[in-house]
Amino acid sequence: HNTTVFQGVAGQSLQVSCPYDSMKHWGRRKAWCRQLGEKGPCQRVVSTHNLWLLSFLRRWNGSTAITDDTLGGTLTITLRNLQPHDAGLYQCQSLHGSEADTLRKVLVEVLADPLDHRDAGDLWFPGESESFEDAHVEHSISRSLLEGEIPFPPTS
């Protein structure tokens, strides 16, 4: 799996999308997890509704939300009130029994300032000889922080 980069600005919201084959993953719940160590499992942050038919309903855990368009084949994760501690490696997963297939590996980068990212035409990409090939960077549409929003602490 290549890693897709989503960049957001501290204090704003970041939307991460994970496309998948809707037929292949028909009937499967999805999850969003965080890689907190070099080894060991990806730690679950939030998963879609227990009833697959209700996967379109947004589920929250702290400041992280998940919703699944099962017909269109797009899992969407929203990280609200993005902060530096949200930066890191994540995975979108498709669940079947006790197993989980990785739909997409995601690197979340949290910028201190909207002007800190390079414009799309000016983005620097690692060369093919590097360990992460075909880096793909997305600048998510974000909005200002709502009063009283609290960051979600990482699972320990």
Partner: antibody, heavy 120, light 107 residues
Framework: EVQLQQSGPELVRTGASVKISCRAS????????IHWVKQTHGRSLEWIGY????????SYNQKFKGKATFTVDTSSSTAYMQFNSLTSEDSAVYYC?????????????WGQGTSVTVSS | DIVMTQSHKFMSTSVGDRVNITCKAS??????VAWYQQKPGQSPKLLIY???TRHTGVPDRFTGSGSGTDFTLTISNVQSEDLADYFC?????????FGAGTKLELK
């Protein structure tokens, strides 16, 4: 073993600029971040900012915005920090430090430091 | 900016002792805290991240704890090589900030 090799000490005039290099070895440069940290009087540490070796994205401490500029040369696995319009307040030891994508802000390996002395 | 306060600039200890180095954040930083050790003339070394996760190769006599605003680095069975400066750092909010340091010295 992971190593970050920084350029040597600098003695510069007030108003001049300085460019410090930080060469990484024994790890995949593009999988990590390079942070820059200022240390004065061998005590207090100040985070200047970081550059992503993966995307080239930067984040600066507002205090150093316009003063510091980060760049990377992936072909030589080297990160650079340029410091402009130097004053006596900028005399310090500057460190580069690595962090991983998994823990982007736990700086797990540090360079040996570059001493910058600003003289009038 | 979040201020990380290390109330003890110096702490005296003896070899074999147990010592607690504390750090207080001016606002909630969840568990986004790291601890570093720095010996004279050397670069800082990462000991702990995520408040309690020990970095690879760090002896298990170093333990981190705390969440929210209060954090502690505990060194049990202090060794002579542990005499150094210890800094806490928060990465919950920009800019990332460090404590002023606590110097661990022999009684």
């Amino acid at each position: 073993e992971v190593q970050l090799q920084q350029s040597g000490p600098e003695l510069v005039r007030t108003g001049a600029s300085v460019k410090i290099s930080c060469r990484a070895s024994s790890y995949s440069f593009t999988d990590n971040y390079i942070h820059w940290v200022k240390q004065t009087h061998g005590r207090s540490l100040e985070w200047i900012g970081y550059i992503s070796g993966y995307t080239g994205a930067t984040s600066y401490n507002q205090k150093f915005k316009g003063k510091a500029t980060f760049t990377v040369d992936t072909s030589s696995s080297t990160a650079y920090m340029q410091f402009n319009s130097l004053t006596s307040e900028d005399s310090a030891v500057y460190y580069c430090a690595r962090s991983t994508m998994i823990a982007p802000y736990g700086m797990d390996y540090w360079g040996q430091g570059t001493s910058v002395t600003v003289s009038s | 900016d979040i201020v990380m306060t290390q109330s003890h600039k110096f702490m005296s200890t003896s070899v074999g002792d147990r010592v607690n180095i504390t750090c207080k954040a001016s606002q909630d930083v969840v568990t986004a805290v790291a601890w570093y050790q720095q010996k004279p003339g050397q670069s800082p070394k990462l000991l702990i991240y995520w408040a309690s996760t020990r970095h690879t190769g760090v002896p298990d006599r170093f333990t981190g704890s705390g969440s929210g605003t209060d954090f502690t680095l505990t060194i049990s069975n202090v060794q002579s090589e542990d005499l150094a400066d210890y800094f806490c750092q928060q990465y919950s909010r920009y800019p990332l900030t460090f404590g002023a340091g606590t110097k661990l010295e022999l009684k």
